[in-house]
């Protein structure tokens, strides 16, 4: 028996369902009573889901997995993983045994989009050209860790005096806080871009300083 899986990682959004595709080519006369199908975590060999001798043995993985029973006889051994979590990320091995056996691994990459950044200034009043200000760009509930870029009004990257911290919450999602310390010009716009490297999703935030008072562009 030959097992086939997709070579590319499966990308799944947090809280959605993902299908880990796995197939085999049944011989003529094949019946499910001959099939041993096991899905396991590749690294640890921990059982995820199994099907033995015509019987679905159920989910051993927080009761969030399912096979496609009606498609098994056609050689579709795919696994459905429901309500994907950050902790589900990793490699899964599909192990099929009929007379002989074969296995193949498929990777699951979990992702969550970052929120539109919120911008704050400190100090936020009585600002004069030449003052040092701290601009904080905050974006929430993304995965995996973000890439953060700062630019000025002319699109020139600002790389000095930037401190970025990323903290995972109890669900494993990251909150990003990036702080830019800059000396004010007469007026200027400062933009922060938070990029999710897996989703290639960019979230933008900016603040414009035009003398007094400071203005924030309206939410998109």
């Amino acid at each position: 028996v030959e097992v086939q899986v997709s070579e590319d990682p499966v990308v799944a959004l947090v809280d959605t369902d993902a299908t880990l595709r796995c197939s085999f080519s049944p011989e003529p006369g094949f019946s499910l009573a001959q099939l041993n199908l096991i899905w396991q975590l590749t690294d640890t060999k921990q059982l995820v889901h199994s099907f033995t001798e015509g019987r679905d043995q159920g989910s051993a993985y927080s009761n969030r997995t399912a096979l496609f029973p009606d498609l098994l006889v056609q050689g579709n051994a795919s696994l459905r993983l429901q309500r994907v979590r950050v902790t589900d990320e990793g490699s899964y091995t599909c192990f099929v045994s009929i007379q002989d056996f074969d296995s193949a691994a498929v990777s699951l990459q979990v992702a969550a989009p970052y929120s539109k950044p919120s911008m704050t200034l400190e100090p936020n009043k009585d600002l004069r050209p030449g003052n040092m200000v701290t601009i904080t760009c905050s974006s929430y509930q993304g995965y995996p860790e973000a890439e953060v870029f700062w630019k000025d009004g002319q699109g020139v990257p600002l790389t000095g005096n930037v401190t970025t911290s990323q903290m995972a919450n109890e669900r494993g999602l990251f909150d990003v806080h990036s702080v830019l310390r800059v000396v004010l010009g007469a007026n200027g716009t400062y933009s922060c871009l938070v990029r999710n490297p897996v989703l290639q999703q960019d979230a933008h935030g900016s603040v414009t300083i035009t003398g007094q008072p400071l203005t924030f562009p309206p939410e998109a």
Partner: antibody, heavy 117, light 106 residues
Framework: QVQLVQSGAEVKKPGESLKISCKAS????????MHWVRQRPGKGLEWIGM????????NYNERFKRKATLTVDKSISTAYLQWSSLKAEDTAMYYC??????????WGQGTLVTVSS | QIVLTQSPSTLSASVGDRVTMTCSAS?????MYWYQQKPGKAPKLLIY???NLASGVPIRFSGSGSGTSYTLTISSMQPDDFVTYYC?????????FGQGTKLEIK
């Protein structure tokens, strides 16, 4: 005919570890889940976990995850239960059992483990 | 985990009696399995998939039920049957057993 023959009785001191064997014959050892179950004196049956020899896949009862390690040696059709840091309350009969579909249809004779200082 | 509660814990009967014991699951299970255990021996599979007799088991044993309620019936008790019986489920992990029903001679 299917046979599961377990290693002999063991007397251990608290804190010691233990390795019990279960030698299978009469069927294709590689293709069937092997379970381990324990029974403390005068008590009921407790499922420890199971292992599939062919793939090496295992599943533990969370309760015993830190205590038990299941392994197999396919070349000699033998399953093993390793138990770490024994306590007096681990005194029990330990059984291996082969399963087909969803039933454990053949059981070993049991290995009596006594933990006493 | 699914908790299986067997009742009664102890049952007194005489040879020839019809005996029924029950196994109640804390949540629905697809199938129930029944084992017989004699003193000092390993458990032996009696009933699989709720109602199917395992190989070599006398037809006086029968099983039934669905959902959360299952029964094992012995139609005519024989001297050999006065031992302990366990139910077991494999509908979810961990696999669990009932606490047992012990049959005693009245």
């Amino acid at each position: 005919q299917v046979q599961l023959v377990q290693s002999g009785a063991e007397v251990k001191k608290p804190g010691e570890s233990l390795k019990i064997s279960c030698k299978a014959s009469g069927y294709n050892f590689n293709n069937y889940w092997m379970h381990w179950v324990r029974q403390r004196p005068g008590k009921g049956l407790e499922w420890i976990g199971m292992i599939h020899p062919n793939s090496g896949t295992f599943n533990y009862n969370e309760r015993f995850k830190r205590k038990a390690t299941l392994t197999v040696d396919k070349s000699i059709s033998t399953a093993y239960l390793q138990w770490s840091s024994l306590k007096a309350e681990d005194t029990a009969m330990y059984y291996c059992a082969k399963s087909t579909a969803l039933a454990t249809d053949y059981w070993g004779q049991g290995t009596l483990v006594t933990v006493s200082s | 985990q699914i908790v299986l509660t067997q009742s009664p814990s102890t049952l007194s009967a005489s040879v020839g009696d019809r005996v029924t014991m029950t196994c109640s699951a804390s949540s629905s299970v697809s199938y129930m399995y029944w084992y017989q255990q004699k003193p000092g021996k390993a458990p032996k599979l009696l009933i699989y998939d709720t109602s199917n007799l395992a190989s070599g088991v006398p037809i006086r044993f029968s099983g039934s039920g669905s959902g959360t309620s299952y029964t094992l019936t012995i139609s005519s008790m024989q001297p050999d049957d006065f031992v302990t019986y366990y139910c077991q489920q494999w509908s979810s992990y961990p696999l669990t057993f009932g606490q047992g029903t012990k049959l005693e001679i009245k």
